[in-house]
Structure formats: structure tokens, C-alpha cells
């Protein structure tokens, strides 16, 4: 070993070196949170970049760059360091037009904390391992969601466009003429029935057990879907999103109530099956895989 390499190894294994890097990263993070940093912070930025460059040079000199099993670039954690330094110099010395987009990569410096704190390294390692192991569960989840999305598509396509429309129109008004002139929220409220405080017209259905319209209103299929058009089963993608909502139980009871009002109470069976299979079984299966991966990583 050359004297330079021996010195590099001594620095690398020294606890103070790890402390220096740790403090540098944390200080850098504090500086990154500043809204309007003063001009002198530019010099501090250069100092940080210098320390990171020094750290990487020490690692490269001690371990070698990329040829050999334990060299610098063979450790994935060092890829992060390398990217941080490359972007630091890129944003500083190369004029790349939209620099603000590249400056975003400075945030990656915060991720350097992971490689320095052993506990964090274990957790992130477990996370990466769990993602690898999750592939099969994810395939199963996507498959189940797709199957139920297709069922939902067949059962509820267009149903959430059912609205309670005012019967007593002016003598020359028709549904089409009204829909062509409707612009503001006030216009909609003039012709469709809205419950107090609701942002969407009252949903209704054509089956006996679906929601009925109040007196003076009739159920029609017209206009857009509820929640600014985002809640529907009209296409596979929207149905898939709705099923994902059910699986994650993201305000699912609202989707449940909307659909049952428009389609009929019988369809609660669909929701019971989806919640039991998707929300209770699949979600817990995912959690089990993550827990197993973490346990393996700890051992």
C-alpha cells in the first residue's frame, strides 16, 4: 500500500471522520431549509461541496474506484455520494439553462444521512429488500384490483352521472338547451337538486332500491361525474382508481354511498367483497411481507 492509501484508510476508519461528515450533512440540511439565504451562504455551499469531494476522494483512495470487489462504486450507497458531487459541480460550473430543476437534486444530500447512521441503513435495507419481495404480492394486488375494476365497470358504468333534474322547465326549455347554456355553479343549482352543503347534484337511480328524487324532480343521466368528475366507473382507469380507493379505505364510505344511491342497495355485496379481500386481506399480506423482510434484514 502506498503512503497516500494508508493515510486514506486511517482517515476513513476514524470515528471523527464519520462525525465530521454527519455534522456536515445535518448543517447542510439546515441551510437548505432557508427561504431567502444570504449571499454568504454561497461560500458555505462551496465548503460543503469541498467536504463531500474530500470524503469521496478518501474513499476512492482507500478502496479504489471501480475495479475490484470492495471498491468505491461497488457499494450502492456510494452511488448516492457520487451523484451528489456530480450535480454539485454541474449546477455550479455548467450553464444548463433551467438550473432550478437541477438544484432540486441538492436535496439528495439529505439522503447521505442514511449511509452514515447504521440504524437507518438497516431500515432502508429492509425497505429495499421488502420491495423486491413485494413484487409477487403487488402482481396479485394489481390483478385483484383489475378484476374488480372490470366488474365495477360492468355494474356501475355511467351510474354516477344520474342526477335529479327539475321537471318544471320554462315552456321553451329542453334538457339539451339547458345543458348547452349551463356555465356556473348557480346555473346547475337552478336545474338540479342539491342537498344542503353539497357540492354535487343529488344522485339517483332507476332501480326500485336506488335513491329516488324529491317531488318536482326526475332522474336523468346527464352532465359530469361527482367530485369534479374524478369519481366514476366509466372507464377501466377510473374504475381501477375507485377500487384502489376502496382498498386503501380513502374516504371509501362516500364512494360506497354514492354508488349505492345510483345503482341500488343490492350492490353492497360488491363493496363487502372488495373491502374484505382488498382492504383486510391484501393490505395485511403486504404488511406481512414488509415485516418478514425487516426481520430477515435484522438477522
Amino acid at each position: 500500500f502506498s503512503p497516500l492509501r494508508r493515510i486514506s484508510i486511517k482517515i476513513l476508519v476514524h470515528s471523527l471522520f464519520s462525525m465530521l461528515i454527519m455534522c456536515t450533512i445535518l448543517t447542510n440540511c439546515i441551510f437548505m431549509t432557508m427561504n431567502n439565504p444570504p449571499d454568504w451562504t454561497k461560500n458555505v455551499e462551496y465548503t460543503f461541496t469541498g467536504i463531500y469531494t474530500f470524503e469521496s476522494l478518501v474513499k476512492i483512495l482507500a478502496r479504489g474506484f471501480c475495479v475490484g470487489e470492495f471498491t468505491f462504486l461497488r457499494d450502492p450507497w456510494n452511488w448516492l455520494d457520487f451523484v451528489v458531487i456530480v450535480f454539485a459541480y454541474l449546477t455550479e460550473f455548467v450553464n444548463l439553462g433551467n438550473v432550478s430543476a437541477l438544484r432540486t437534486f441538492r436535496v439528495l444530500r439529505a439522503l447521505k444521512t442514511i449511509s452514515v447512521i447504521p440504524g437507518l441503513k438497516t431500515i432502508v435495507g429492509a425497505l429495499i429488500q421488502s420491495v423486491k419481495k413485494l413484487s409477487d404480492v403487488m402482481i396479485l394486488t394489481v390483478f385483484c384490483l383489475s378484476v374488480f375494476a372490470l366488474i365495477g365497470l360492468q355494474l356501475f358504468m355511467g351510474n354516477l352521472k344520474h342526477k335529479c333534474f327539475r321537471n318544471s322547465l320554462e315552456n321553451n326549455e329542453t334538457l339539451e338547451s339547458i345543458m348547452n347554456t349551463l356555465e356556473s355553479e348557480e346555473d346547475f343549482r337552478k336545474y338540479f337538486y342539491y342537498l344542503e352543503g353539497s357540492k354535487d347534484a343529488l344522485l339517483c337511480g332507476f332501480s326500485t332500491d336506488s335513491g329516488q328524487c324529491p317531488e318536482g324532480y326526475t332522474c336523468v343521466k346527464i352532465g359530469r361525474n361527482p367530485d369534479y368528475g374524478y369519481t366514476s366507473f366509466d372507464t377501466f382507469s377510473w374504475a381501477f382508481l375507485a377500487l384502489f380507493r376502496l382498498m386503501t379505505q380513502d374516504y371509501w364510505e362516500n364512494l360506497y354511498q354514492q354508488t349505492l344511491r345510483a345503482a341500488g342497495k343490492t350492490y353492497m355485496i360488491f363493496f363487502v367483497v372488495v373491502i374484505f379481500l382488498g382492504s383486510f386481506y391484501l393490505i395485511n399480506l403486504i404488511l406481512a411481507v414488509v415485516a418478514m423482510a425487516y426481520e430477515e434484514q435484522n438477522q
Epitope: M157, G158, F165, N167, S168, F206, E215, T218, C219, V220
Partner: nanobody, 124 residues
Framework: EVQLVESGGGVVQPGGSLRLSCAAS????????MRWYRQAPGKQREFVAR???????GYADSVKGRFTISRDAAKNTVYLQMNSLRPEDTALYYC??????????????????WGQGTLVTVSS
């Protein structure tokens, strides 16, 4: 496809009566309202009467007290009973309805549908 068919028109003497009917056919789920319009030769189409799915009625001032609109929900049919007819009632009478129906492919569609019209002639 939804179709509206009017019937009951014909020639009648002033002061006489006629009963027009308008039947909606197709895979109808709901009829919101049904209205009668008329168009005399060389004139614009004018509203005559209307009835909603909860049987609320409305009439043009010119026919109030003489014409009565009614409906048979089970048959998807609306009737216009015209009494004390006058020569100025001579026109082609059209039926219009707001219908929600199951169309091709099983999808549901709501729209305004019109009939072809039935001719009423009041003359001595």
C-alpha cells in the same frame, strides 16, 4: 330507440272536442315530463300544455280552462283532452318528452324526444 307517436287528430267543428294521445315506446326507464306544442301554418311553434312525472300540470293562457292534460304512467302515454275548440286551434300538434331510456349496448341515455305530429283542423 325511443319513439313518440301522436294520434287522435282530425277535423272537428268549432265548439267540438278531441282527445289527442302521445305514446312513448322503447326501453324507457323514466319520463320526466311530457309536453304538447302546436304549430299553425305560417306561425311559430307554441307551447300548449305539460305534465311532469309527479303529475304537476301547466297550460298556455290561450287554452286554460278548455284543454286538460293527463297521463297514464304505466303505458308511458300522455293525453290532451281538447274541449270548446276554436278555428284558431287549427295546427299540427306535437308531443315532446324528457325520457331516460336504456339504449344500444345497455347504456342509459337521457334526452328530449319529439313526435312527428298529428293534425287538428277546426272548421265548420
Amino acid at each position: 330507440e325511443v319513439q313518440l307517436v301522436e294520434s287522435g287528430g282530425g277535423v272537428v267543428q268549432p265548439g267540438g272536442s278531441l282527445r289527442l294521445s302521445c305514446a312513448a315506446s322503447g326501453r324507457i326507464l323514466r319520463i320526466g315530463y311530457m309536453r304538447w306544442y302546436r304549430q299553425a301554418p305560417g306561425k311559430q311553434r307554441e307551447f300548449v300544455a305539460r305534465i311532469t312525472d309527479d303529475s304537476a300540470t301547466g297550460y298556455a293562457d290561450s287554452v286554460k280552462g278548455r284543454f286538460t292534460i293527463s297521463r297514464d304512467a304505466a303505458k308511458n302515454t300522455v293525453y290532451l283532452q281538447m274541449n270548446s275548440l276554436r278555428p284558431e286551434d287549427t295546427a299540427l300538434y306535437y308531443c315532446e318528452a324528457l325520457v331516460t331510456a336504456s339504449v344500444r349496448g345497455g347504456s342509459i341515455h337521457s334526452g328530449t324526444y319529439w313526435g312527428q305530429g298529428t293534425l287538428v283542423t277546426v272548421s265548420s
